[in-house]
Interface confidence: medium
């Protein structure tokens, strides 16, 4: 009724001293590798020569911090960020930051980034969109209330409002260019 070698689980590491034989009823606790977090029970139990329980390690890391218009990241750049790691932004002059200066990797998702707004209410260049472009020549600065229009590349369909407007130093939500479904 004893159990032999410990079962292995992806990204899980057994804690304590490894043994050749485990007695019935004996429990072994696992911990997760860096960037991973235990989802559910962390131990296995030896019952009737078999191990019961399945520790599951979930990847809680983040990649690619959110892009913030008119800002740059001032903290250390990493290829992978563990949960709890923070990334700090700074606005380019003359933009002013509104919102939390930092984003945090929270169990695999980034928290909401700040915005960098021009205190005069002006906007920078319109945000680029995938598979689409603005119909006018892009300027470096746009006056408050000015607007631009987007158009999609061939075979792509526009979703949302094609016109965006500069309000309080921020552009309104740009449209998306979607590939039409092929049946």
């Amino acid at each position: 009724t004893d159990c032999l070698s410990l079962p292995s689980f992806e990204n899980a590491i057994p804690m304590g001293e490894k043994k050749d034989v485990y007695k019935a009823g004996e429990q072994v606790t696992y911990t997760c590798a860096t960037y991973y977090k235990m989802d559910g029970a962390s131990n296995v139990t030896c019952i009737n020569s078999r191990w019961t329980g399945r520790p599951t390690c979930r990847d809680t890391s983040c990649v690619n911090p959110p892009t913030v218009q008119n800002a740059y990241i001032v903290s250390r750049q990493m290829s992978k960020y563990p949960s709890g790691e923070r990334v700090r932004y700074q606005c380019r002059s003359p933009y002013e930051m509104f919102g939390d200066e930092e984003v945090m990797c929270l169990n695999g998702n980034w928290t909401e980034p700040p915005q960098c707004k021009d205190s005069t209410g002006k906007c920078g260049p319109p945000p680029p969109i995938d598979n689409g472009d603005i119909t006018s020549f892009p300027l470096s600065v746009y006056a408050p209330a000015s607007s631009v229009e987007y158009q999609c590349q061939n075979l792509y369909q526009l979703e949302g409002n094609k016109r965006i407007t500069c309000r309080n130093g921020q552009w309104s939500e740009p449209p998306k260019c979607l590939h039409p479904c092929v049946i």
């Epitope: 923070r86 002013e96 930051m97 509104f98 919102g99 939390d100 200066e101 930092e102 984003v103 945090m104 929270l106 998702n109 928290t111 909401e112 700040p114 915005q115």
Partner: antibody, heavy 117, light 107 residues
Framework: QVQLQESGPGLVKPSQTLSLTCTVS????????VYWIRQHPGKGLEWIGV???????EYNPSMKSRVTISKDTSKNQVSLKLSSVTAADTAVYYC???????????WGQGTSVTVSS | DIQLTQSPSSLSASVGDRVTITCKAS?????LHWYQQKPGKAPKPLIY???NLASGVPSRFSGSGSGTDFTLTISSLQPEDFATYYC??????????FGAGTKLELK
């Protein structure tokens, strides 16, 4: 460990300016934003405003004209000033640290303010 | 501005019960946070960003939802869970708002 403590007068006369201080320890105001929240007797929570780590402020639109939040990083203090107070400003005032995503992780114990002549 | 409507406003339950509190936003939101408050005390964070348990919070608490509908669930009510619960939202384009609260009382 992280702590926030509100202080200020418990009684303020109508039309005067309410001044409260939040003294923090266990973290730096250059790294975290601090919120002010209030709670009227027997009622829910109301956001007053926030001062971000970089010093920019945001206020509840309903109180914006009367509120000023500032900080002295060297003293680890955040201050709240609320002008032209009335009996409707009678509440428990809390300061709280920003966690991320506009959530609060650590709160002060609150300070009770009564507006009365 | 986005309004948060909590239901029920009060709830009577017994130790061991499974309890669900809902928070409905007037328009779609990305994140919602939950707090617990006991009489005479400051609120305490329970759940961040819809489903992430705050530090030191027992696993009997869980959060879920998306869009406009969110829930806080207590799988097996304990004596220390009787309190008032608040949901909260804030985005870069909306003021920070709290729900009106749900008072959880002993049946």
């Amino acid at each position: 460990q992280v702590q926030l403590q509100e202080s200020g007068p418990g009684l303020v006369k109508p039309s005067q300016t309410l001044s409260l201080t939040c003294t923090v320890s266990g973290f730096s105001l250059t790294n975290y934003g601090v919120y002010w929240i209030r709670q009227h007797p027997g009622k829910g929570l109301e956001w007053i405003g926030v001062i971000w780590s970089g010093g920019t402020t945001e206020y509840n639109p309903s109180m914006k004209s009367r509120v000023t939040i500032s900080k002295d990083t060297s003293k680890n203090q955040v201050s709240l000033k609320l002008s032209s107070v009335t009996a409707a400003d009678t509440a428990v005032y809390y300061c709280a640290r920003n966690f991320g995503n506009y959530a609060m992780d650590f709160w002060g114990q609150g300070t009770s303010v009564t507006v009365s002549s | 501005d986005i309004q948060l409507t909590q239901s029920p406003s009060s709830l009577s339950a017994s130790v061991g019960d499974r309890v669900t509190i809902t928070c409905k936003a007037s328009s779609s939101v990305t994140y919602l946070h939950w707090y617990q408050q006991k009489p005479g005390k400051a609120p305490k964070p329970l759940i961040y960003a819809t489903s992430n348990l705050a530090s030191g919070v027992p696993s009997r608490f869980s959060g879920s939802g998306s869009g406009t509908d969110f829930t806080l669930t207590i799988s097996s009510l304990q004596p220390e869970d009787f309190a008032t619960y608040y949901c909260q939202h804030r985005s870069s384009s909306n003021p920070l708002t709290f729900g009106a609260g749900t008072k959880l009382e002993l049946k």
